[in-house]
């Protein structure tokens, strides 16, 4: 099963630096909505990794919208003062990693993952579907990346980012990968896999931005997000080619990206099971 389906494209298979997000909605594009008001709001820009101003129309839009710069930073940036994370220093875990597992009060019984501060590991638990707290992850991988320590006692996420003074672009700094990468693909490629809320078990693929590969997951049939593809090829075509590898010697290999991306159409209604 070749990971490539297009000629003349060079993509290295080394582990890619993750663009870590505290919340998946931080990866959404700024959405001014269909209304015509002029309201100053802030959104998190995944390409500059900074909170920026935009004009909101006053209705609809998405969750990547904040009343203030401070609120945006609080929700979407991990360390506002120092954007470079040294691997020799343990990166601080978010406070919510230390909250105990909380099923919430509803009765949905959805499998989720939480960081157990006693065992220092991410573990499975049953979430009811509403309320609870933020120590609640849809995938084990997401939980580990945010809350677990690596094998040497450091955070798993030990990549930093640094603003490049030459062209104001972001270049991730990594101890694992000698070359540098930038992500120029669709923002939904950075969101976690989302099963949705229905009962089906459809085979789908999502792009795992932590390891830079398309991985299978089970889709419930409704809800979820746009990081959801019917085939691995389609997933790779939409997401993997968004990475540009900067070669150490200054060369640049730009991967081809087709303009049109066929994506799975997702129905955003929810089907709730009676007596949930």
């Amino acid at each position: 099963d070749s990971e490539e389906d297009e000629e003349h494209t060079i993509i290295t298979d080394t582990e890619l630096p993750p663009l870590k997000l505290m919340h998946s909605f931080c990866a959404f594009k700024a959405d001014d909505g269909p209304c015509k008001a002029i309201m100053k709001r802030f959104f998190f820009n995944i390409f500059t990794r900074q909170c920026e101003e935009f004009i909101y129309g006053g209705c609809e839009g998405n969750q990547n919208r904040f009343e203030s710069l401070e609120e945006c930073k609080k929700m979407c940036t991990r360390d506002n003062a120092n954007r470079i994370i040294k691997t020799t220093l343990q990166q601080e875990k978010p406070d919510f990693c230390f909250l105990e597992e909380d099923p919430g009060i509803c009765r949905g019984y959805i499998t989720r993952y939480f960081y157990n501060n006693q065992t220092k590991q991410c573990e499975r638990f049953k979430y009811g579907g509403c309320l609870g707290n933020m120590n609640n992850f849809e995938t084990l991988e997401e939980c580990k990346n945010i809350c677990e320590d690596g094998p040497n006692g450091f955070q798993v996420d030990n990549y930093g980012t640094q603003l490049n003074a030459v062209n104001n672009s972001l270049t991730p700094q990594s101890t694992k990968v000698p070359s540098l990468f930038e992500f120029h693909g669709p923002s939904w490629c950075l969101t976690p896999a989302d099963r949705g809320l229905c009962r089906a078990n459809e085979n789908r693929f999502y792009y795992n931005s932590v390891i830079g590969k398309c991985r299978p997951f089970k889709y419930s049939g409704c809800g979820g997000n746009e990081n959801n593809f019917t085939s691995k090829q389609e997933c790779l075509r939409a997401c993997k080619k968004g990475f540009i590898q900067r070669i150490s010697k200054g060369g640049l290999i730009k991967t081809k990206r087709k303009r049109k991306k066929q994506r799975v159409k997702i129905a955003y209604e929810e089907i709730f099971v009676k007596n949930m």
């Epitope: 909605f25 969750q63 909380d102 099923p103 919430g104 009060i105 509803c106 009765r107 009811g128 509403c130 309320l131 609870g132 707290n133 809320l197 929810e270 709730f272 949930m276």
Partner: antibody, heavy 121, light 107 residues
Amino acid sequence: QVQLQQSGPGLVKPSQTLSLTCAISGDSVSSNSAAWGWIRQSPGRGLEWLGMIYHRSKWYNDYAVSVKSRITINPDTSKNQFSLQLNSVTPEDTAVYYCARYSSIGHMDYWGQGTLVTVSS
Amino acid sequence: DIQMTQSPSSLSASVGDRVTITCRASQSIRSYLAWYQQKPGKAPKLLIYKASNLQSGVPSRFSGSGSGTDFTLTISSLQPEDFAVYYCHQYSDSPVTFGQGTKVEIK
């Protein structure tokens, strides 16, 4: 039919502790499918959620940030009731306090009759 | 916290009128929304839960719709006993929050 009966003083002095109790009939405070909470209502602030407790193999609580440092909600399984304690009250805490039951799908389906608590010296 | 914004804050209507109250959440709350009716000196009374489900014993003239961020409570034919304050309430995320209320008055 679930019923919630509130009791407690209507007048509390500033800096003291507000204590209210909610007695449950028709359900159990230890139910694995319900939750129990307190809400208050004042003219200036509308309906304000204060916190809840619930039992799912062990006890959990969830408190509003605005009162987190001062609030305790405790179950009393022997009397099938739960209580609210709010420490260091000020006149700002003057409100009608309600206890409520949360159903297994999250909404509040039964409410106590309400207790007007005035904080004044 | 999720902000719940109700509109209008008050309205005047006559018996028999069709009344619509809207509630907007500051972010998606899926279908975790309830509507309550409150009369002076009384506790709120549950009308609608999970956005569109009618609570047992509530007259069928009350109905709810919506999901995500925009929700509506409709009273198809206003009755004298319906004059009250109506609140929406989200229970998707903690802390649970309420709208500021809509007062339905007699015209």
